[in-house]
Interface confidence: low
């Protein structure tokens, strides 16, 4: 008997209160199917029902967490039904408070190098899940290390490529509620750098300014970068601007920093809209120093 294929859209990780579409596809083209849930709480809306093409399930509660299979109608089978499909595990998030997700040594990772993603919580989670935005396959399951202050897991990811870069979130769960997940951690953008040639970074009116004076940093390149990213050493996050084509054939973005009070080392990167987590090599560092201020970074 041909097994149908069961899938979940937009994915298998669903926030409490949201909806998920379960789609059962038969290679023989039959579009009627039944759904069953193997574990977790029973879901009465599945009982003795025939679905056509897909089933919109929700708003989901922890009761919907569990393993689903479908059987498609199959007139040539003695029972009238196909063999059960592949299992799809629906995980419901928002049951516990969110963990924290960090990258060591940082979220900007050179192409080919390794980054450690650390998910931690003051809740004693025995399992963690790591999920990349836009990926429909099951999240990565990781065993947590329990300690008096809570729990954590370290995941070594690499060698870094554009395929591994993206927006990551982690979730925690406890063994006796394996498909009921915490709220997601705050998103962490893991970026692969060093894929393209470095842009140039300059300062107007210059890299040394009076305290309170306006300064603008210009990032430019002859590469067709859509976006430039400006980062300051020892600071999380970055400024992001769309590149503009200049008369001289360079693609440039101007970052007005406004009246500056503290200096620092700045770098900029270029990237393309189509690959937002894949950046160029960093520009040479530009030290901006502020005079008339006791603090020089």
């Amino acid at each position: 008997q041909d097994k149908p294929f069961l899938s979940a859209w937009p994915g298998t990780v669903v926030s409490e209160g949201q909806h998920v579409t379960l789609q059962c596809r038969s290679r023989l083209g039959f579009n009627e199917f039944s759904l069953s849930k193997e574990d977790g709480m029973p879901v009465p809306e599945l009982y003795n029902r025939i679905f056509r093409n897909s089933f919109l399930m929700g708003p989901v509660t922890p009761a919907h967490a569990g393993t689903y299979r479908c059987c498609s109608s199959h007139p040539h089978s003695p029972t009238g039904w196909s063999a059960p499909s592949n299992p799809v595990v629906i995980m419901v998030t928002g049951v516990h408070r969110k963990p924290s997700l960090l990258a060591h040594p940082g979220p900007l990772v050179k192409s080919g190098e390794t980054v450690i993603l650390q998910c931690w919580s003051d809740v004693r989670f025995e399992r963690f899940l790591l999920h990349r935005e836009g990926i429909t396959e099951d999240p990565l399951r990781l065993v947590g290390q329990l300690h008096d202050a809570g729990s954590q897991v370290n995941y070594s990811m690499g060698p870094m490529t554009p395929a591994l870069a993206g927006t990551y979130r982690c979730f925690g769960s406890v063994t006796h509620l394996p498909y009921e997940l915490s709220a997601p951690s705050d998103p962490l953008d893991i970026v692969v750098v060093g894929l393209y040639g470095k842009p140039s970074l300059s300062a107007q009116p210059g890299p040394t300014v009076q305290a309170g004076e306006n300064v603008t940093l210009s990032c430019s390149s002859r590469s067709l970068f859509d976006i430039y990213h400006l980062s300051r050493e020892a600071e999380a996050g970055e400024l992001r601007l769309t590149a503009v084509l200049r008369v001289n054939g360079t693609f440039q973005a101007n970052f007005p920093l406004g009246p500056v009070t503290h200096g620092g080392n700045y770098r900029c990167f270029g990237s393309f809209r189509a690959l937002p987590h894949a950046w160029s090599d960093p520009s040479d560092p530009l030290p901006v120093s502020v005079t008339g201020n006791s603090r020089h970074l």
């Epitope: 193997e38 574990d39 977790g40 709480m41 029973p42 569990g66 809740v123 004693r124 025995e126 065993v143 063994t175 006796h176 509620l177 394996p178």
Partner: antibody, heavy 121, light 107 residues
């Protein structure tokens, strides 16, 4: 249907060890926590810890740490609880209890019939 | 460790009475609480989990309520087979702890 069948009563001397078994049937053994709970005569219930047979992960009540060992034999779907350095206050009925009323979900769903362990010189 | 204080420790009631047993947690356990019934010489039986969800096959005269630190088990109309000892259990974190029990006796 789910069944948890425990080994028979034991009489032990102080300082000895006891190993109680709990044979499971009627469900996927490796998918559910098995907890151990004890009850001294005329007293309340006390949680000792659990084992997750899927990966042999354990979590023990600190009160019993160093004295209790929980193991699982997946070939026979049996969980064992061994308690060492027995003293008279360990005299109790020992229960195994499977987690999750609906799947691996919540609290304790199914209980063994209990095993009386008597510690006496 | 989280302490579970159950009250009363015993009560006398008649068939048909409405019976209420309370359990108080020493800190917030959200709704991670179960109620059990135990008869002499028998293993406990789960009645309610996640504070208010009734186990399949348990009569609807049993109900649970509460969240956070204060929880209640109610038997709306006591039946002869309900005379037993009742325990609460929290499973919000390790170690799990039980309440001291409430013995429901015939008046």
């Amino acid at each position: 249907q789910v069944q948890l069948v425990q080994s028979g009563a034991e009489v032990k001397k102080p300082g000895a060890s006891v190993k109680v078994s709990c044979k499971a049937s009627g469900y996927t053994f490796t998918s559910y926590n098995m907890h151990w709970v004890r009850q001294a005569p005329g007293q309340g219930l006390e949680w000792m810890g659990y084992i997750f047979p899927g990966d042999a992960g354990t979590n023990y009540n600190q009160k019993f740490k160093g004295r209790v060992t929980m193991t699982a034999d997946t070939s026979t779907s049996t969980v064992y609880m061994e308690l060492s350095s027995l003293r008279s206050e360990d005299t109790a009925v020992y229960y195994c209890a499977r987690s999750g009323y609906y799947g691996n979900y919540e609290g304790f769903a199914y209980w063994g019939q209990g095993t009386l362990v008597t510690v006496s010189s | 460790d989280i302490q579970m204080t159950q009250s009363p420790s015993s009560l006398s009631a008649s068939v048909g009475d409405r019976v209420t047993i309370t359990c108080k947690a020493s800190q917030d356990i959200q709704s991670y609480l179960s109620w059990f019934q135990q008869k002499p010489g028998k293993a406990p039986k789960t009645l309610i989990y996640r504070a208010n969800r009734l186990v399949d096959g348990v009569p609807s005269r049993f109900s649970g309520s509460g969240s956070g630190t204060d929880f209640t088990l109610t038997i709306s109309s006591l039946q002869p087979e309900d005379f037993a000892t009742y325990y609460c259990l929290h499973y919000a974190e390790f170690p799990y702890t039980f309440g001291g029990g409430t013995k429901v006796e015939i008046k």
